[in-house]
């Protein structure tokens, strides 16, 4: 017999998901309008075209890059698109009833929409840690509670250390990464004898999940330019970060290759590093003043990468439960972290000329705001993994992790794969 | 020549509604960030909103959100402050000023390099 | 908040300091801008970055920072200097400047 949904999910996913809908909906009613001032149409195309990079990013590239499990990827695909949907419009009311409020109605633009797709981002990143091992309905949960964690975040860095919003969004990296890994440290670990081909990739998903790397590739010199604020800065955000990620790929592929007895590249080496450039230079991307610059960063992230991608999945599979494949939780906490500190580098030798004897204080600063960010992903991870273990959720059984049968109708399958 | 000029200002009702308009010349408007600014009788100035260079992003101060949209027309160069609502305390000279970005070490810095002459808006009954 | 005094004098030829101050977030990692604004005419950039003078600006204005304090000297006072002062740094979580309370500078 192919495997059945459980019976409880079945009545819980579609009741839990619509009635949650159906709030939004009402929320949405109550309390949003369109932004009536669209003079120049022009300009609103130009605007929408960054949205539509960051949706096929969000989509399309982290999609498909989570998608190379033997028999999971259509869960992946669709289980993304699922939580972008959902994020994006629960994204869209929290960061208005942050910042808008007192106004009484929260104001729909392009950049809302954009600030959004960026937040739901986040939740992509870090279920990369945990696909495979939740259903629907635990999604759902995780969706709701680390979107509400980023955009308080957000709104705390804003107030508090008065960053603009791409220097507080730019924390994205180090807070997905670091809130997937705790929720997954929650999560059941081990893998019971005989599934264990489940985790493996398999060659048809794994192309697939090279078409993912190849989208996020072309799209994130958009991502790390979306909410600059001058187009000074925006081409200085573009081009340091293609310079970035074209010599990220060359490392990575290279370095794969390097790190391998016979010389062979892996396949998920490559999907993870080459977007390792992207991701180091994200804080400093528009303030890099020459391509020498990123592109040497570029080669640093690729060699972290791959570094990374050769000795840490032993630690994180006995750890935290990650297969081997699930690499964008480390790698994105280690390349975030290194451009966290290329910041605070940038922010030494700024701070020496913009009045004297606030260096420490500068440096403690941004070390206070990236701290706050771990320690809140760390906290609202862990958080989401007990809410996530509760019998409600019906979890499915170890010994259907990362099973595309337990989720989808295939009407040409009468047992197993 | 690089210029701003205002105009739209002029005496409303409590509760009555203005649309301020500022023309740019001498520069191209959609590279820059604007700005509107007033200065109240008797009191300092104050900074109203700003609307970025794409016109994607807009903000105000927290006494006019829900009543001002500031928005632009980059093909005719202009840019705007649509003004409902008004209360007697919005009587003031309004300021269109346009947003310069220089870059540093670990941030860009922006102020307001260029201002209008300013139109001024009466609340009155 | 940006406070500054709200008045200040002197005589002709004379040198006047104004003063600026606030939070570390506001004023401690960001640089300072001072503009004039004339009786009936729009405010002029006076001062950027801290201490530059944008071209058109005599040199007898200067401007200085420290820590969370910045200052405005106007050296060889004349009676055209009369006018309001204000020291503006960028707030990045507003999206604008934030304009200190000005300074009333009277040229006896």
């Known amino acids: 017999m192919s495997s059945k949904y459980p019976r409880s999910v079945r009545r819980c996913l579609p009741l839990w998901a619509l009635t949650l809908e159906a709030a939004l909906i009402l929320l949405f009613y109550f309390f949003t309008h369109y932004d009536a001032s669209l003079e120049d149409q022009k300009g609103l195309v130009a605007s929408y075209q960054v949205g539509q990079d960051l949706t096929v990013m969000a989509a399309i590239g982290l999609g498909f890059l989570t998608s190379s499990f033997r028999r999971h990827s259509w869960s992946s695909v669709a289980f993304n698109l699922f939580m972008l949907a959902l994020g994006v419009q629960w994204a869209i009311l929290l960061d208005g009833f942050l910042s808008q409020f007192p106004s009484g109605k929260v104001v729909i633009t392009l950049f809302s929409i954009r600030l959004a797709t960026m937040s739901a981002l986040s939740v992509l990143i870090s279920v990369d840690a945990v696909l495979g091992k939740v259903n629907l309905a635990q999604l759902v949960v995780m969706v709701l509670v680390e979107v509400t964690a980023l955009g308080n975040l957000r709104m705390v860095i804003s107030n508090i250390f008065n960053t603009d919003y791409h220097m507080n969004m730019m924390h994205i990296y180090v807070f997905a990464a670091y809130f997937g890994l705790s929720v997954a440290w929650c999560l059941p670990k081990p893998l019971p004898e005989g599934t264990e081909d489940k985790d493996q990739t398999a060659t048809i998903p794994s192309l697939s999940a090279m078409l993912g790397a190849l989208f996020l590739w072309m799209f994130w010199p958009s991502f790390n330019s979306a909410l600059l604020r001058s187009p000074i800065e925006r081409k200085n955000a573009v081009f340091n970060t293609y310079y970035a990620v074209a010599v990220s790929v060359v490392t990575a592929i290279s370095g794969s290759s390097l790190a391998h007895p016979q010389g062979k590249i892996s396949k998920t080496y490559v999907h993870s590093a080459v977007l390792a450039g992207g991701v180091a230079v994200g804080t400093s991307c528009h303030l890099i003043p020459s391509p020498w610059l990123a592109m040497v960063l570029g080669l640093v992230a690729g060699l972290i990468s791959v570094g990374g991608a050769k000795y840490l999945p032993g630690c994180c599979n006995r750890v935290l439960g990650i297969p081997h494949s699930s690499i964008m939780g480390y790698n994105f906490s280690l390349l975030g972290l290194l451009g966290e500190i290329i910041y605070i580098v940038l922010l030494v030798l700024d701070t020496v000329g913009a009045g004297n004897g606030m260096i420490g204080f500068q440096v403690l600063l941004s070390i206070g705001e990236l701290s706050l960010a771990i320690v809140i992903a760390l906290m609202s991870g862990l958080l989401t993994g007990l809410l996530l273990n509760l019998k409600i959720w019906k979890a499915p059984h170890e010994a259907k992790y990362f099973d595309d049968q337990v989720f989808w109708k295939f009407p040409h399958l009468a047992v197993g794969f | 020549q690089v210029k701003l000029l205002e105009s739209g200002g002029g005496v409303v009702q409590p509760g009555g509604s203005l649309r301020l308009s500022c023309v740019a010349s001498?520069?191209?408007?959609?590279?820059?960030?604007m700005h509107w600014v007033r200065q109240a009788p008797g009191k300092g100035l104050e900074w109203v909103a700003f609307?970025?260079?794409?016109?994607?992003?807009?903000g105000y101060v927290d006494s006019v959100k829900g009543r001002f949209t500031i928005s632009r027309d980059n093909s005719k160069n202009m840019v705007y402050l649509q003004m409902n609502s008004l209360r007697a305390d919005d009587t003031a000279v309004y300021y269109c000023?346009?947003?310069?970005?220089?870059?540093?070490?670990?941030?860009?810095?922006?102020?307001?390099?260029?201002w209008g002459k300013g139109t001024t808006v009466t609340v009155s009954s | 908040v940006v406070t500054q005094p709200p008045s200040a004098s002197g005589t002709p030829g004379q040198r006047v300091t104004i003063s600026c101050s606030g939070s570390?977030?506001?004023?401690?990692?960001?640089?300072v801008y001072w503009y004039q604004k004339l009786p009936g005419t729009a405010p002029k950039l006076l001062i950027y970055?801290?201490?530059q003078r944008p071209s058109g600006v005599s040199d007898r204005f200067s401007g200085s920072k420290s820590g969370t304090s910045a200052s405005l000297a106007i050296s060889g006072l004349r009676s055209e200097d009369e006018a309001d002062y204000y020291c503006?740094?960028?707030?990045?979580?507003?999206?604008?400047?934030?304009f200190g309370g000005g300074t009333k500078l009277t040229v006896l």
């Open positions: 609307i970025w260079f794409d016109g994607s992003n807009k």
């Open positions: 570390n977030s506001i004023l401690g990692s960001k640089y």
């Open positions: 001498g520069f191209t408007l959609r590279s820059y960030g």
């Open positions: 000023a346009r947003e310069k970005a220089l870059r540093g070490i670990s941030r860009y810095n922006y102020y307001l390099d260029v």
């Open positions: 503006a740094p960028w707030d990045a979580n507003l999206g604008g400047p934030v």
């Open positions: 970055k801290n201490d």
